[in-house]
Interface confidence: low
Amino acid sequence: PRSIDVKYIGVKSAYVSYDVQKRTIYLNITNTLNITNNNYYSVEVENITAQVQFSKTVIGKARLNNITIIGPLDMKQIDYTVPTVIAEEMSYMYDFCTLISIKVHNIVLMMQVTVTTTYFGHSEQISQERYQYVDCGRNTTYQLGQSEYLNVLQPQQ
């Protein structure tokens, strides 16, 4: 069998809401994946599991099942949404994200995604990790790749 290539393209949109009483930020982050089937037979994308981390803490998880079938030598673009919550010990971020004196409230999030594909009863998992900028201060739609966090240095521990 030939390879199945998974490429994490980036954040497509981030929709934000706040709870002033709980000092909590809710971010619905939609991501885009390109999945390429290099085989001469169809492949089923069985599930996508994703999680988002902020400052080494998991703030959101999502799982999509029975997603699609990719034909021979074909590519499909798949969007998936991860609901995230920044709260409790990270509630200090609430003030940053709601400060009107700041125009762009970018935070760095680590996107992790695992794609499970099946063909002829065989299962294969491909994982990706990527750091992305997301604006926690307003609803934002991104040009694909625009939210890439290019700095090779990891966020401080």
Epitope: S17, Y18, V20, Q21, K22, T98, I100
Partner: antibody
Framework: QVQLQQPGAELVKPGASVKLSCKAS????????MHWVRQRPGQGLEWIGN????????HYNHKFKDKATLIVDKSSSTAYLQLSSLTSEDSAVFYC????????????????WGQGTSVTVSS | DIVMTQATPSIPVTPGESVSISCRSS???????????LFWFLQRPGQSPQLLIY???NLASGVPDRFSGSGSGTAFTLRISRVEAEDVGVYYC?????????FGSGTKLEIK
Amino acid sequence: QVQLQQPGAELVKPGASVKLSCKASGYTFTNHWMHWVRQRPGQGLEWIGNIDPSDSDTHYNHKFKDKATLIVDKSSSTAYLQLSSLTSEDSAVFYCARSRGGYYDYGEAMDYWGQGTSVTVSS
Amino acid sequence: DIVMTQATPSIPVTPGESVSISCRSSKSLLHVNGNTYLFWFLQRPGQSPQLLIYRMSNLASGVPDRFSGSGSGTAFTLRISRVEAEDVGVYYCMQHLEYPFTFGSGTKLEIK
């Protein structure tokens, strides 16, 4: 239309407890915080606390912490205020009022109020 | 706790006149997100309170535009232009920036 239905009156003996109800209709119960407010005869309004019906998250005025318990029953869209160890000082009208969801830009908060339940503590 | 002060217990007014009701808070109610978390309520005799103004200056649904709210972070004013007989009652300010939420003691509007 939005309605918050409260019983008109409750007569309770000193030392007893009472559970006041506030039945919500005309909106999605779990999308709106429910607040409780006390008004003693001839006095002003005092905020007792509130509860988020979606997850039962509560906040209390510390003044009422040992006196009041807020609970909800999602299946019947009803909020309850339980008052314990009642004395004549607890005689008052108790209002429930809903506010919009917690989003910081939430607009018309505490926009609907019940008619209030008059609690009289007397032997 | 944030203390809300309504220093004027009652205001007599003639129908058709304008009136201002004041309220002060012991701490600024201006949040970093730009909103000022102050309500104004009217409680007519024998009735439940009714929301008039939210976030200091926003008119609640169904409230006549004779009512308006203004203020800074700690000093607030409810203005009623052309007072009508139905405006009588007790006016309360309330902060909902911090728990516990707190009300002012109320200002009674009376017709002369």
